[in-house]
């Protein structure tokens, strides 16, 4: 498990003639936001595949109004990083789509209008844990500058975040109340599935399903500190050289989660797990009903019988949690054989097989391709005496000689109009929907299929 992080540095007119002055105007002030979609890069899935590695939406940037006659400044951007958590292994090679969206804040009927300003896409190689990589992409007359990296979430380590490390002897090596020493390379071992929610920093397990706490931590999920003593023990300052780290004030100190929410530390901050009926960063928002759209990922909301549970979310396959906000990690059962990489797509499990293997669970051993050629950059896979080409984007047929029809499967949802494009396909979304495949509804009341999705597009104009 880990997080892909994207930092947008600038978005504006690119160099050269014909560049637009600004996406906003004096008559129509606007603000920008960004969406990133990640896919496994060496995937055999078609261009219209979902964002299998995940997607994220930024906050909206500051309002910008073009000043007539003034030189075009850099456009104000939303604060913070775009973070895309991934549950499975980091694939190393990935494809990205970054969309720049504009919210127009004029006096339109039905609220602000949304439009896609630019979409850039690419395929990159990136090892988890590496430094920030910088990139510049152009879309038409626009230029986007950004950096990105992938980092593992403890206890995962390695360039693919597939090795889980925990200090076996941490409790004895570190004194009471101290964080465990940095895990050593030889103390990594095969993944163990601890109890759900067990703190990755302060808990560990010897057996699947248990959650044992390091000294200084308690609670069923090892999230409650016992004491805050330091490495300077009564025996004198020498113990400060043992490699133990003194914890500063923890982000969960004083429990910032309101309304009975439980706090767990994350590498950068904290996370509140809220009781049903409450949500928000600190569980501060209450009185939620089905009208508030609390069920994510297509969950079905049903009004609760008692006041303390104003609603119940019935989650679709692949999701769990009181708001269907958590993805079920069905890959923990390691269904893919022969070293195949497991992808949980929500509606189904998919195995991405290593070279030489095929089948739904990578169970078939293939012969090599014996020099058979696939056209237009396709790669050859052979099994049972017959070779098959895995074609590059935009091509199909037995030998990848035919131009593929990327719109054949009607990939644009909710009335979106599909166009074949040099990069595969592009969707023109009907008002009220957004995303690379028009998959995200944007509701006028601000609730959305994405927790952070923006408020509604203007309703469609009636045809006369």
């Amino acid at each position: 498990a880990g997080v892909f992080e994207l930092q947008i540095h600038s978005f504006g007119p690119g160099p050269g003639p014909g560049a637009p002055r600004s996406p906003c105007s004096a008559r129509l002030p606007c603000r920008l936001f960004f969406r990133v979609c990640l896919k496994p890069g060496l995937s055999e899935e078609a261009a219209e595949s979902p964002c299998a590695l995940g997607a994220a939406l930024s906050a909206r940037g500051p309002v910008y109004t073009e000043q007539p006659g003034a030189p075009a400044p850099d456009l104000p951007l939303p604060d913070g990083l775009l973070q895309v958590p991934f549950r499975d292994a980091w694939p190393g090679t990935f494809s990205f789509i970054i969309e720049t969206w504009r919210e127009e804040l004029g006096d339109q009927i039905g609220g602000p209008a949304w439009s896609l300003l630019a979409r850039v896409a690419g395929r990159r190689r990136l090892a988890a844990g590496g430094p920030w990589a910088r990139d510049i992409q152009r879309a038409g007359a626009w230029e986007l500058r950004f950096s990105y990296r992938a980092r593992c979430e403890p206890p995962a380590v390695g360039t693919a975040c597939t090795r889980l490390c925990r200090p076996r002897s941490a409790p004895s090596r570190c004194g009471p109340g101290l964080r465990p020493c940095a895990p050593l390379e030889d103390e990594c071992e095969a993944p163990l599935v601890c109890r759900a929610g067990c703190s990755p920093e302060h808990g560990f397990c010897e057996q699947p399903g248990e959650c044992r706490c390091l000294e200084g931590w308690t609670g069923p999920l090892c999230t409650v500190p016992v004491s805050t003593s330091s490495c300077l023990s009564p025996r004198g300052p020498s113990s400060a050289t043992t490699g133990c780290l003194v914890p500063g004030p923890g982000p969960c100190d004083g429990n910032p989660c309101a309304n009975g929410g439980s706090c767990s530390e994350t590498p950068r901050s904290f996370e509140c797990t809220c009781p049903r009926g409450f949500y928000g960063l600190r569980c501060e928002v209450s009185g939620v009903t089905c009208a508030d759209g609390p069920c994510f990922n297509g969950g079905l909301c049903v009004g609760g019988a008692d006041p303390d549970s104003a609603y119940i979310c019935h989650c679709p396959p692949g999701f769990q949690g009181s708001n269907c906000e958590k993805r079920v990690d069905r890959c923990s059962l390691q269904p893919c054989r022969n070293g195949g990489l497991c992808l949980d797509l929500g509606h189904a499990l998919r195995c991405r097989c290593r070279a030489g293997f095929a089948g739904p669970r990578c169970e078939h051993d293939l012969d090599d391709c014996a020099g058979r050629a696939c056209a237009n950059g396709g790669t050859c896979v052979e099994g049972g005496g017959a070779h098959r080409c895995s074609c590059a984007l935009g091509f199909g047929g037995r030998d990848c000689r035919e131009r593929a029809d990327p719109c054949a499967a009607r990939p644009c949802a909710h009335g979106g109009r599909c166009y074949a494009h040099f990069s595969g396909l592009v969707c023109a979304c009907a008002p009220g929907y957004m995303g690379a495949r028009c998959e995200f509804p944007v509701h006028p009341d601000g609730a959305s299929a994405l927790p952070a999705a923006p408020p509604g597009l203007r309703p469609g104009d009636p045809q006369r």
Epitope: G140, R410, C418, Y419, V426, A428, G460, Q463
Partner: antibody
Framework: QEQLVESGGGLVQPEGSLTLTCTAS?????????MCWVRQAPGKGLEWIAC????????TDYANWAKGRFSISKTSSTTVTLQMTSLTVADTATYFC???????????????WGPGTLVTVSS | QVLTQTPSPVSAAVGGTVTISCQAS????????LAWYQQKPGQPPKLLIY???SLASGVPSRFKGSGAGTQFTLTISDLECDDAATYYC????????????FGGGTEVVVK
């Protein structure tokens, strides 16, 4: 060179039917966006009729007034037809075939047109 | 959905400037999905401007589109004899389906 040519126009009786054909050369429909029909009555303005996806999905869009009497279909990777029924004198026009492409997040951009074929409805 | 073009006809001398207005009864898709076409007698229309203000390939920069939402303008500067033609605006909309409508056309006479 990319080209569109319409055929099938001519004189037809009121209440009659006619099928127009649009043939492409220099490109294939599946590699483009949508193929559309637009008409223009003598001395009048342009009027959009219908579009069909260039790909195999066959998705169609019609002007409200054209639904029921007009039918667009793709007969091959380079031909599109427009079937017209219950024709009236008001349908007398030059019928153009046009290609609709996606450019910079906008659609219904007709960047390639045929020369047109004249349909005359008269008794 | 109605697109109203004014004025028609419009005339100007060679080297002059003409401005054609296109008023939509409701906002076009994405506020900018409006195109301009030029049509000469006996010929099919030719795409000049897309996305309200972007110049189509091969079109001289004397043609300039502007506007958003419901109000759009085509400006032709440094008029040439060859610019004499009828100009149409075309808007795109969505209401339970995609559709497009054209304005009534504006004839430009070059003196």
């Amino acid at each position: 060179q990319e080209q569109l040519v319409e055929s099938g126009g001519g004189l037809v009786q009121p209440e009659g039917s006619l099928t127009l054909t649009c043939t492409a050369s220099g490109f294939s429909f599946s590699s483009s966006g949508y193929m559309c029909w637009v008409r223009q009555a003598p001395g009048k303005g342009l009027e959009w009729i219908a579009c069909i996806s260039g790909g195999s999905s066959g998705d169609t869009d019609y002007a409200n007034w054209a639904k029921g009497r007009f039918s667009i279909s793709k007969t091959s990777s380079t031909t599109v037809t427009l079937q017209m029924t219950s024709l009236t004198v008001a349908d007398t026009a030059t019928y153009f075939c046009a290609r609709d492409v996606y450019i910079d997040s906008t659609i219904f951009n007709f960047n390639l047109w045929g020369p047109g074929t004249l349909v005359t409805v008269s008794s | 959905q109605v697109l109203t073009q004014t004025p028609s006809p419009v005339s100007a001398a060679v080297g002059g400037t003409v401005t054609i207005s296109c008023q939509a009864s409701q906002s076009v898709y994405n506020n900018n999905n409006l195109a301009w076409y030029q049509q000469k007698p006996g010929q099919p229309p030719k795409l000049l401007i897309y996305a309200a203000s972007s110049l189509a390939s091969g079109v001289p920069s004397r043609f300039k589109g502007s506007g958003a939402g419901t109000q759009f303008t085509l400006t032709i500067s440094d008029l040439e004899c060859d610019d004499a033609a009828t100009y149409y605006c075309q808007g795109t909309y969505y209401s339970s389906g995609w559709y497009s409508t054209f304005g009534g056309g504006t004839e430009v006479v070059v003196k």
